[in-house]
């Protein structure tokens, strides 16, 4: 009963984590323009993944497309990357555990094969977590920096000659979104690597057998022999997505105002 | 079409308020921010605030803060603007104007002469 | 506040001839997310309220004979009357609609000459 409802918890918590995850990477608000500290302006910026959005006090919005691909920065391909796989991983994950939450029957599945594909959903969703973790990271990552970069010009006066106003941008929305379905879709995948352990047959269908030795009888139960699966070399968390080293200007290039189209 | 309906000329004493209205027909009212602009005799334009009537969100101009109070009725799609503490100078034609995209205002009432004078 | 200088303060032009008045503001009104300038041109008639007539710089609101047009980018703007007429006579009032409070030039004075 309890690994039922583990499983089934840590479906229904896995699903909530995908839907969070999609929904982040769908978004718009991914960073936001910084309203501290700064003078108050009629017009308020804000951008996603795929889209930069501008939305005028008179509540009139206009969201532009990114239409480049070759044009844009290369953390911003990577948090896309990241994101889909999650979304990719995670749909699978969904696709595969369904068939084997405990309370769908199917034929005449077996507990191991059950135990085999809760493990590998379990898998995916931990992965598809860390991506999604991983995505949102890199991107606030990329914000900081570009903060930080856009402060010291807006003191510095390194911006004499740009005629536009320094926009500064912050943790949008979107973020915690995904940080928080990220973190929901690996939780998940733990409570079905969790479940998995208990749906994989603990004893062999042996009979026990007496054997009765001179003074005393003592009865020995072959058992413990846990069903292999198969996963074990996979059990620990590969190491999803290496950015690799990069230079300051490469990590710098990402532009402060975002204008990819 | 679009029509912004002021309230009547009024004439005040030093200190006391105004309140002057303006009623919106012709579209959504909640759809569009109010702004409230003065002119004062053969002088430029000031704006003084906003207010977004479908939430009641509310923008000032610092320099009027604490004496102009911007309101919205949406039943009867109208705008208040009311200024206490009169002063003569601010003996002024006072306008509402509805803000369209681009944050300018496209439709503006015919505006009320408001003469403060002891 | 932004200040919005206008200039020339009053224009004389002969019917048929090209007006241009100047518009320049304290600090950039071109925004970086849309790359839209945040500055309108309103005319104005004696006795009348103000008609808006260019908005985001360049953009020309609908009904506006094309003989207007706006230019400029950042902090320095212009209203082009390429050919005057008699019931152009009026003043023109730049407005900041970037940058809270939202502030209008001082004017200027369009007359027959």
């Known amino acids: 009963m309890a690994v039922t409802a583990c499983q089934g918890l840590g479906f229904v918590v896995s699903l909530i984590g995908i839907a969070g995850i999609i929904a982040a990477t769908c978004m718009d608000q991914w960073s936001t323009q910084d309203l501290y500290n700064n003078p108050v302006t009629a017009v308020f910026n804000y951008q996603g993944l795929w889209r930069s959005c501008v939305r005028e006090s008179s509540g009139f919005t206009e969201c532009r497309g990114y239409f480049t691909l070759l044009g844009l920065p290369a953390m911003l391909q990577a948090v896309r990357a990241l994101m889909i796989v999650g979304i990719v991983l995670g749909a699978i994950g969904l696709l595969v555990s369904i068939f084997a939450l405990k309370c769908i029957r199917i034929g005449s599945m077996e507990d191991s094969a059950k135990a085999n594909m809760t493990l590998t959903s379990g898998i995916m969703f931990i992965v598809s977590g860390l991506c999604a973790i991983a995505g949102v990271s890199v991107f606030a990552n990329m914000l900081v920096t570009n903060f930080w970069m856009s402060t010291a010009n807006m003191y510095t006066g390194m911006g004499g000659m740009v005629q536009t106003v320094q926009t500064r941008y912050t943790f949008g929305a979107a973020l915690f979104v995904g940080w928080v379905a990220g973190g929901l879709t690996l939780i998940g995948g733990v409570m079905m690597c969790i479940a998995c352990r208990g749906l994989a047959p603990e004893e062999t269908n042996y009979k026990a057998v007496s054997y009765h030795a001179s003074g005393h009888s003592v009865a020995y139960k072959p058992g413990g022999f846990k069903a292999s699966t198969g996963f074990g070399s996979n059990t620990k968390n590969k190491k999803i997505y290496d950015g690799g080293a990069r230079t300051e200007d490469e990590v710098q290039s990402y532009p402060s105002k975002h204008d990819y189209v | 079409q679009v029509q912004l309906v002021q309230s009547g000329a009024e004439v005040k004493k030093p200190g006391s308020s105004v309140k002057v209205s303006c009623k919106a027909s012709g579209y959504t009212f909640t759809n569009y921010l109010i702004d409230w602009v003065r002119q004062a005799p053969g002088q430029g334009l000031e704006w003084m605030g906003g207010?977004?009537?479908?939430?009641?969100?509310?923008v000032y101009n610092e320099k009027f803060q604490g004496r102009v109070t911007l309101t919205a009725d949406k039943s009867s799609m109208t705008a208040y603007m009311e200024l206490s503490s009169l002063r003569s100078e601010d003996t002024a034609v006072y306008f509402c104007?509805?803000?369209?995209?681009?944050?300018?205002?496209?439709?503006w009432g015919q505006g009320t002469l408001v003469t403060v004078s002891s | 506040d932004i200040v919005m200088t206008q200039s020339p303060d009053s224009l004389a032009v002969s019917l048929g001839e090209r007006a241009t008045i100047n518009c320049k503001s304290s600090?950039?009104?071109?925004?970086?997310?849309?790359?839209?300038?945040?500055l309108t041109w309103y005319q104005q008639k004696p006795g009348q309220p103000p008609k808006l007539l260019i908005y985001w710089a360049s953009t020309r609101e609908s009904g506006v004979p094309d003989r207007f047009s706006g230019s400029g980018s950042g902090k320095d703007f212009t209203l082009t009357i390429s050919s005057l007429q008699a019931e152009d006579v009026a003043v023109y009032y730049c407005?900041?609609?970037?940058?809270?409070?939202?502030?209008f030039g001082g004017g200027t004075k369009v007359e027959i000459k």
């Open positions: 207010i977004n009537p479908g939430s009641g969100d509310t």
């Open positions: 407005q900041n609609n970037y940058f809270y409070p939202l502030t």
């Open positions: 600090q950039s009104l071109l925004n970086s997310g849309n790359q839209k300038n945040y």
């Open positions: 104007a509805r803000r369209v995209r681009g944050n300018s205002f496209d439709s």
